[in-house]
Amino acid sequence: EINGSANYEMFIFHNGGVQILCKYPDIVQQFKMQLLKGGQILCDLTKTKGSGNTVSIKSLKFCHSQLSNNSVSFFLYNLDHSHANYYFCNLSIFDPPPFKVTLTGGYLHIYESQLCCQLK
């Protein structure tokens, strides 16, 4: 297992929510990406391929997510101070083999300006 801090901007704020960007190498064809908050699994997305190169996308812990050819974005809404924590992208690579797990993460700071419904 490879651990490290994300060397890219992992958190993108908009409209009182946050997009958490989990990158993976574009050579990766089949994988599972989990978003962890501390040690808790918040979201996951698994991409696998069929014999005719058809693609299956599955989520056991569903969050609003977006898949590209080198990243999975997970979206969290209605931010409040309780969202402040360490978040990790836990990537399990199935294809190309051999099986490999990488963990990258960062701390999500919550500032008043990023909250969705500030009290006046």
């Epitope: 069929g50 299956s56 199935f94 083999p97």
Partner: antibody
Framework: EVQLVESGGGLVKPGGSLRLSCAAS????????MHWVRQAPGKGLEWVGV??????????YYSDLVKGRFTISRDDSKNTLYLQMNSLKTEDTAVYYC????????????WGQGTLVTVSS | DIQMTQSPSSLSASVGDRVTITCQAS??????LSWYQQKPGKAPKLLIY???LLAEGVPSRFSGSGSGTDFTFTISSLQPEDIATYYC????????FGPGTKVDIK
Amino acid sequence: EVQLVESGGGLVKPGGSLRLSCAASGFTFSDYFMHWVRQAPGKGLEWVGVIDTKSFNYATYYSDLVKGRFTISRDDSKNTLYLQMNSLKTEDTAVYYCTATIAVPYYFDYWGQGTLVTVSS
Amino acid sequence: DIQMTQSPSSLSASVGDRVTITCQASQDISNYLSWYQQKPGKAPKLLIYYTNLLAEGVPSRFSGSGSGTDFTFTISSLQPEDIATYYCQQYYNYRTFGPGTKVDIK
């Protein structure tokens, strides 16, 4: 212990039909892509076709040599794979193997012992 | 359809010899190539997948290399139990086997 046991082979006349079965045990059958591979006497291996898992809507794909004549199906509740062979030709004479493959999260590949199909008048 | 060719079609070598078999794909298959061993009257056995990864329980004298369209399978020191026919197989797009290479002892 992983086992794949083919059955249903035998002698059939050209133009006839035969249905092969493959009973699986010792692994999670429903997670595996299931293939049929054949080998004519004294010849090499030839891929016949595959049926994918439920995640891929049990999609089937066939080699050009059998397309339109052979049909692969599976019953995950019975851990059984089938090959329906119609309009058989003498060149379909072979040992037919069922094979199970998976790539996620690890690559595994299991084979049965084969069943002989002879197409002859 | 992807076609696979293999050479030589047969070879004889002495125990302890290094044996090399080549396999060529008709189009780029990245590293999606496996190698099988088949002994007479038996089902094929997976030796190597994804070009160079050894299947479980396979001795380290077997190895593979290559990428794209050209691949090589090597037995570093031939043993009597290695007498068999060896097949390459692409799994980039469905499956296609090479015609096989029969290996025997001089």
